[in-house]
């Protein structure tokens, strides 16, 4: 048993029928010694008396809020949560496996630049009685500070018969050095509690691996005289690291006809302009990627040819 936060405790249980469970001793937080009784949740049934209560925790029915009283007055509470271990593996029931980039990916994180700021998100089908707490650090043995905000519900989607809820959190490395080579990964830890169940999820990454620039901005077309060609120009996104001479991007320019089946013309360039042929009803799209480290491409920025 361990303390998650004040008056909230997690009991780790092997989740198979013959497992012995955990013997837990609760102590009433009071100087009183006599006349103390214990109850569980809203029940008035007295479970025991005395300053301590010993319980055998085996099932969710043994978890919940234990309260000690004296003469009708509440003295203290202890909330017991369960963390299930099935076949030697901690349960991962609360969050959905996003399966990207690989199976058992519950947390996904992205950074728009090298400033040490990043966003993580996760998915669940649970709509109520759900709380998250996020902690982060760089390295684990001698951790350096990363500050995370509160997790918030950022999107709701319908997936077949189910509703899916996306939560996200923003974190900032306290003493980020954008130009430095990373040697220790960022660790992100999410505590998830659904009713009486506790689970934890972790992700470990280097900022360089989760970089995804914003799309290029100010995408413009300039027709070239007496030609079907146009000059496409754009700018680095505002959120990208500076100076651009050091934090450089490379770009992919794509001409896409109305039909998805039509052949796409693609041009790769390190410049912020390119000359392409603009077909009727086509659109021109540009996306960006770190020039020196192949992390994710940005989303596309697009303009119609007409």
């Amino acid at each position: 048993i361990w303390e998650l936060k004040k008056d909230v405790y997690v009991v780790e249980l092997d989740w198979y029928p013959d497992a012995p469970g955990e013997m837990v001793v609760l102590t009433c937080d009071t100087p009183e010694e006599d006349g103390i009784t214990w109850t569980l949740d809203q029940s008035s049934e007295v479970l025991g008396s005395g300053k301590t209560l010993t319980i055998q925790v085996k099932e969710f029915g043994d978890a919940g809020q234990y309260t000690c009283h004296k003469g009708g007055e509440v003295l203290s509470h202890s909330l017991l949560l369960l963390h299930k271990k099935e076949d030697g593996i901690w349960s991962t029931d609360i969050l959905k496996d996003q399966k990207e980039p690989k199976n058992k990916t519950f947390l996904r994180c992205e950074a728009k630049n090298y400033s040490g700021r990043f966003t993580c998100w996760w998915l669940t089908t649970i709509s109520t009685d759900l709380t998250f707490s996020v902690k982060s650090s760089r390295g684990s043995s001698d951790p350096q500070g990363v500050t995370c905000g509160a997790a918030t519900l950022s999107a709701e989607r319908v997936r077949g018969d189910n509703k899916e809820y996306e939560y996200s959190v923003e974190c900032q490395e306290d003493s980020a050095c954008p130009a430095a080579e990373e040697s220790l990964p960022i660790e992100v830890m999410v505590d998830a509690v659904h009713k009486l169940k506790y689970e934890n999820y972790t992700s470990s990454f280097f900022i360089r691996d989760i970089i995804k620039p914003d799309p290029p901005k100010n995408l413009q077309l300039k027709p070239l005289k007496n030609s079907r060609q146009v000059e496409v120009s754009w700018e680095y996104p505002d959120t990208w690291s500076t100076p651009h001479s050091y934090f450089s991007l490379t770009f992919c320019v794509q001409v896409q006809g109305k039909s998805k089946r039509e052949k796409k013309d693609r041009v790769f360039t390190d410049k912020t302009s390119a000359t392409v042929i603009c077909r009727k009803n086509a659109s021109i799209s540009v996306r960006a990627q770190d020039r020196y480290y192949s992390s994710s491409w940005s989303e596309w920025a697009s303009v119609p040819c007409s």
Partner: nanobody
Framework: EVQLVESGGGLVQAGGSLRLSCAAS????????MGWFRQAPGKEREFVAA????????DYADSVKGRFTISRDNAKNTVYLQMNSLKPEDTATYYC??????????????????WGQGTQVTVSS
């Protein structure tokens, strides 16, 4: 979508046996207390038996103790009710119910969140 599907009911002679099954989907099965209830024509629904999430705690109605056994297979998302030494008064529709994070001493049907459609058990004398 949560589904509980009972099977195994039928007609049996007094003293005989039946094994009811209830297959669950759409829930994290091992988090749920699973209960069996029954309702005879013109009577109130009554509690029969319940089993906690990992199967370490069981509860039975006095009328079936020693004759009925509840069990579960969390790998198969299924709960069973083995009924031996059946009596004509066991004739009823048997329902399976689920309660996430519940307690086995929930003998009131109102404490359960999800219900099956029921399977008929008839015991002839």
């Amino acid at each position: 979508e949560v589904q509980l599907v009972e099977s195994g009911g039928g007609l049996v002679q007094a003293g005989g046996s039946l094994r009811l099954s209830c297959a669950a989907s759409g829930i994290i099965f091992s988090d749920n207390v699973m209960g069996w209830f029954r309702q005879a024509p013109g009577k109130e629904r009554e509690f029969v038996a319940a089993i906690a999430g990992r199967g370490s705690r069981l509860d039975y109605a006095d009328s079936v103790k020693g004759r009925f056994t509840i069990s579960r297979d969390n790998a198969k998302n299924t709960v069973y009710l083995q009924m031996n030494s059946l009596k004509p008064e066991d004739t009823a529709t048997y329902y399976c119910a689920a309660k996430p994070y519940g307690r086995v001493f929930y003998t009131e049907g109102s404490n359960y969140d999800f219900w099956g459609q029921g399977t008929q058990v008839t015991v002839s004398s």
